[in-house]
Interface confidence: low
Amino acid sequence: SPVPPSTALKELIEELVNITQNQKAPLCNGSMVWSINLTAGVYCAALESLINVSGCSAIEKTQRMLNGFCPHKVSAGQFSSLRVRDTKIEVAQFVKDLLVHLKKLFREGQFN
């Protein structure tokens, strides 16, 4: 059976914490990704941004987990209306921003 959304979000947060804490060299070799609007559709938007990073084992599990929250199929190069136009940030910063936002959602009980 699927895990409850609260558990899934908790697992995603734990994975992001793990990434930030275990970061030694620049995450994903300093790859840049599109910054996203965190106020709506965060899971699909985050996946649409991170899926463009390939060959980075550190975020593969995160990519798979985000995939579970997004109902539609996401492929590399897909444009998201939720991205912050023409603004790119390092994956490490993206993960930190996402982590802060998801922790807030979890505290507020917004698991969906």
Partner: antibody
Framework: EVQLLESGGGLVQPGGSLRLSCAAS????????MSWVRQAPGKGLEWVSA????????YYADSVKGRFTISRDNSKNTLYLQMNSLRAEDTAVYYC????????????????WGQGTTVTVSS | SYELTQPPSVSVSPGQTASITCSGD??????AYWFQQKPGQSPVLVIY???KRPSGIPERFSGSNSGDTATLTISGTQAMDEADYYC?????????FGTGTKVTVLG
């Protein structure tokens, strides 16, 4: 253990009504979307309707739109399907399904099915 | 309305590979799901998200999806795999099931 138990099926005349119920147990019912899927005798599967989890959205197949209404009572862990203006072609086994629809779920798809309840529409 | 087309039947010898196709317009842009249904039983999800197996589903079941076709492959088919198989996708706020394929294990 996750379980879905359908009830309410039976024999009804064309134009009549029935209300199907699905009692859920073993999971946090309110967190999940639920669907009804039917299967006519000797035929394939046909999705009928879905009710999203926290989102409160409802969805219907064109074949039942305007005649069937899906609802849920999270306090009773129960999903319902109100079927009005029934036709012979609505004769089928109706399955209650724990769903993976939409942005409200950790989306695995329809991985828990009830045993089904039989609806027969005949005069 | 969106349609998913499957071959009515597929026959396979024990131990061989059975492939079931599911065709739909730009199906590769959607997630494909596969269900197994044995006579008198409720359907069972065997593949979700094109190629992922739920826990408890044997490794011999695999899936792929690209272009207009999703494929369910059963490697080393066993007698217990004889069943009806249905593909499924989500399109325009409705679920769509395929027409179904009866897999017969010969012998």
């Amino acid at each position: 253990e996750v379980q879905l138990l359908e009830s309410g099926g039976g024999l009804v005349q064309p134009g009549g009504s029935l209300r199907l119920s699905c009692a859920a147990s073993g999971f946090t019912f309110s967190s999940y979307a639920m669907s009804w899927v039917r299967q006519a005798p000797g035929k394939g599967l046909e999705w009928v309707s879905a009710f999203s989890g926290s989102g409160g959205s409802t969805y219907y197949a064109d074949s039942v739109k305007g005649r069937f209404t899906i609802s849920r009572d999270n306090s009773k862990n129960t999903l319902y399907l109100q079927m009005n203006s029934l036709r012979a072609e609505d004769t089928a086994v109706y399955y209650c399904v724990q769903d993976g629809l939409g942005p409200y779920f950790y989306n695995y798809g329809m991985d828990v099915w009830g045993q089904g309840t039989t609806v027969t529409v005949s005069s | 309305s969106y349609e998913l087309t499957q071959p009515p039947s597929v026959s396979v010898s024990p131990g061989q590979t059975a492939s079931i196709t599911c065709s739909g317009d730009k199906l590769g842009d959607k997630y494909a799901y596969w269900f197994q249904q044995k006579p008198g039983q409720s359907p069972v999800l065997v593949i979700y998200h094109d190629s992922k197996r739920p826990s408890g589903i044997p490794e011999r079941f695999s899936g792929s999806n690209s272009g207009d076709t999703a494929t369910l492959t059963i490697s080393g088919t066993q007698a217990m795999d004889e069943a009806d198989y249905y593909c499924q996708a989500w399109d325009s706020s409705t679920y769509v099931f395929g027409t179904g394929t009866k897999v017969t294990v010969l012998g």
